[in-house]
C-alpha cells in the first residue's frame, strides 16, 4: 500500500481542516488508514482523524481544530496499521479556504433597487470576520449569456444594484462567495443560490 498523491490540506480558519490524498489502488480509507495530527507545541497531544473514501483510491479527512492562530503548525502522519506511509506538516494560515457565506436574501421591496444581503460565515472573534470580501454572481435562468459578477470589496455583507440593470419580467438567481486578501486565501465555495422574479416599472418615455 502506497500513497500516490500526497495529502494536501486546506483550513476554514475556524474549526476544520480538510486533507485529501490518493492511494495507489482501491482503498477502504476508514478501515485501513489513520491520519494523526498534532500541533507543534510542547503541551499539545496527537489527535486521530478517520478518513472517508473520496472515489476509488481517494481519501478525505476532516481534521477538527477548535481554534486556529497564524503561528500554528501541525505535523501529519498517515498510518496504515503499524506502517507509516507518509509524514508531512501543515500550517493552516497558509492554506485557507474560507467558509461559504450563508442566508443569501434578495430584498425586492426597496423602490427600484435590489438589496442582496448575506451572513458572514465567521463569528466576530475570528480573525477572518473583518477581513472577508465577496463576489456576488447573478444570472438569468432564461438566458445563459446573462451572467454577471459583482465584486464587493467593502466589509458589509450586502450589495445594492438598480433593478433596471437586469431584465424585467424574468427570473434570476444569485449566489455569493468569499475570500480574504490578508491570508491570500482561495475562494470559498459558493453559497446556496436564491431565486427571485425581477420586475420594475419601466421609466415613462416622453416624446
Amino acid at each position: 500500500m502506497k500513497v500516490l498523491q500526497e495529502p494536501t490540506c486546506v483550513s476554514d480558519y475556524m474549526s476544520i481542516s480538510t486533507c485529501e490524498w490518493k492511494m495507489n489502488g482501491p482503498t477502504n480509507c476508514s478501515t485501513e488508514l489513520r491520519l494523526l495530527y498534532q500541533l507543534v507545541f510542547l503541551l499539545s497531544e496527537a489527535h486521530t482523524c478517520i478518513p472517508e473514501n473520496n472515489g476509488g483510491a481517494g481519501c478525505v479527512c476532516h481534521l477538527l481544530m477548535d481554534d486556529v492562530v497564524s503561528a500554528d503548525n501541525y505535523t501529519l502522519d498517515l498510518w496504515a496499521g503499524q506502517q507509516l506511509l507518509w509524514k508531512g506538516s501543515f500550517k493552516p494560515s497558509e492554506h485557507v479556504k474560507p467558509r461559504a457565506p450563508g442566508n443569501l436574501t434578495v430584498h425586492t421591496n426597496v423602490s427600484d433597487t435590489l438589496l442582496l444581503t448575506w451572513s458572514n460565515p465567521y463569528p466576530p472573534d475570528n480573525y477572518l470576520y473583518n477581513h472577508l470580501t465577496y463576489a456576488v454572481n447573478i444570472w438569468s435562468e432564461n438566458d445563459p449569456a446573462d451572467f454577471r459578477i459583482y465584486n464587493v470589496t467593502y466589509l458589509e455583507p450586502s450589495l445594492r444594484i438598480a433593478a433596471s440593470t437586469l431584465k424585467s419580467g424574468i427570473s434570476y438567481r444569485a449566489r455569493v462567495r468569499a475570500w480574504a486578501q490578508c491570508y491570500n486565501t482561495t475562494w470559498s465555495e459558493w453559497s446556496p443560490s436564491t431565486k427571485w422574479h425581477n420586475s420594475y416599472r419601466e421609466p415613462f418615455e416622453q416624446h
Epitope: 500541533l39 510542547l42 503541551l43 497531544e45 481544530m65 477548535d66 481554534d67 503561528a71 500554528d72
Partner: antibody, heavy 122, light 107 residues
Framework: EVQLVESGGGLVQPGGSLRLSCAAS????????MHWVRQAPGKGLEWVSY????????YYADTVKGRFTISRDNAKNSLYLQMNSLRAEDTAVYYC???????????????WGQGTLVTVSS | DIQMTQSPSSLSASVGDRVTITCRAS??????LNWYQQKPGKAPKLLIY???RLHSGVPSRFSGSGSGTDFTLTISSLQPEDIATYYC?????????FGQGTKLEIK
C-alpha cells in the same frame, strides 16, 4: 463541577520521601494533561512537573529532576507525585492543575486544587 | 530558562481605578502567556490565557494584551474583590515559568 483534591502532604525529614495524590472529579480525567505547581511559604508560584493525558509525555523542572516522579492512573481518576530525597527547599504548598487538550484553551492551567502542604524539616 | 519579570511588585489603587500590570519575558514567547489571580490562602485561578482570551466566568473588566516579550493585564475598573496577587506565566518553553507576582491592594 470540576474538582481537584490533593492529599499526602505532611512533615518529613530531609532525605525522606512522600507521595502526593490528586483526586479528580467532574470531568473526563483521561482527556486532560496535568501539572504539579508549588508555592513556598510567602513566595511565588513554581512549576514542578507535567504529564500528558496518556502519560506519553512527561516534563520536570530541573530543581526536581531525578528526585520526583509524576504519574497518573486514569482508571482511578488520580494524579501522583512521588517525591524522594527531599530537601528543605522543597517545603511548599503543592497544587495539582489540569490543562485542556483542546487547542482553543491554548493549554492554560484552567482549574487548580486547593493544595497540600509539604514541610521538609529535621 | 525564560525569566518573567512583573512590574510593579505591589501597587495600591482605589475602587474604580484603571489598573495595569506588566509582564516582560526574557525572550520571545509568542502569545503563550497566561494570567492568574491568587487570593490569600487560596489556590490560583486562571483569568486570561493566550495573552488576551478571557477564561469562562471571569468578569469583562479584566483584559490582556501584548505579544512577543511584553504583556499587560488591565483591570478597567477596580473592584474590592480584585484584591489579590496576580501572576503571569509563560508556557512556550520549558521550564514553564511564572512572574514573581504583583500584589494589588486597595487605597
Amino acid at each position: 463541577e470540576v474538582q481537584l483534591v490533593e492529599s499526602g502532604g505532611g512533615l518529613v525529614q530531609p532525605g525522606g520521601s512522600l507521595r502526593l495524590s490528586c483526586a479528580a472529579s467532574g470531568f473526563t480525567f483521561s482527556d486532560y494533561g496535568m501539572h504539579w505547581v508549588r508555592q513556598a511559604p510567602g513566595k511565588g508560584l513554581e512549576w514542578v512537573s507535567y504529564i500528558s493525558s496518556g502519560s506519553t509525555t512527561i516534563y520536570y523542572a530541573d530543581t526536581v529532576k531525578g528526585r520526583f516522579t509524576i504519574s497518573r492512573d486514569n482508571a482511578k481518576n488520580s494524579l501522583y507525585l512521588q517525591m524522594n530525597s527531599l530537601r528543605a527547599e522543597d517545603t511548599a504548598v503543592y497544587y495539582c492543575a489540569r490543562i485542556s487538550t483542546v487547542v482553543a484553551k491554548r493549554y492554560a492551567m484552567d482549574y487548580w486544587g486547593q493544595g497540600t502542604l509539604v514541610t521538609v524539616s529535621s | 530558562d525564560i525569566q518573567m519579570t512583573q512590574s510593579p511588585s505591589s501597587l495600591s489603587a482605589s475602587v474604580g481605578d484603571r489598573v495595569t500590570i506588566t509582564c516582560r519575558a526574557s525572550q520571545d514567547i509568542s502569545n503563550y502567556l497566561n494570567w492568574y489571580q491568587q487570593k490569600p490562602g487560596k489556590a490560583p485561578k486562571l483569568l486570561i490565557y493566550y495573552t488576551s482570551r478571557l477564561h469562562s466566568g471571569v468578569p469583562s473588566r479584566f483584559s490582556g494584551s501584548g505579544s512577543g516579550t511584553d504583556f499587560t493585564l488591565t483591570i478597567s475598573s477596580l473592584q474590592p474583590e480584585d484584591i489579590a496577587t496576580y501572576y503571569c506565566q509563560q508556557i512556550n518553553a520549558l521550564p514553564f515559568t511564572f512572574g514573581q507576582g504583583t500584589k494589588l491592594e486597595i487605597k
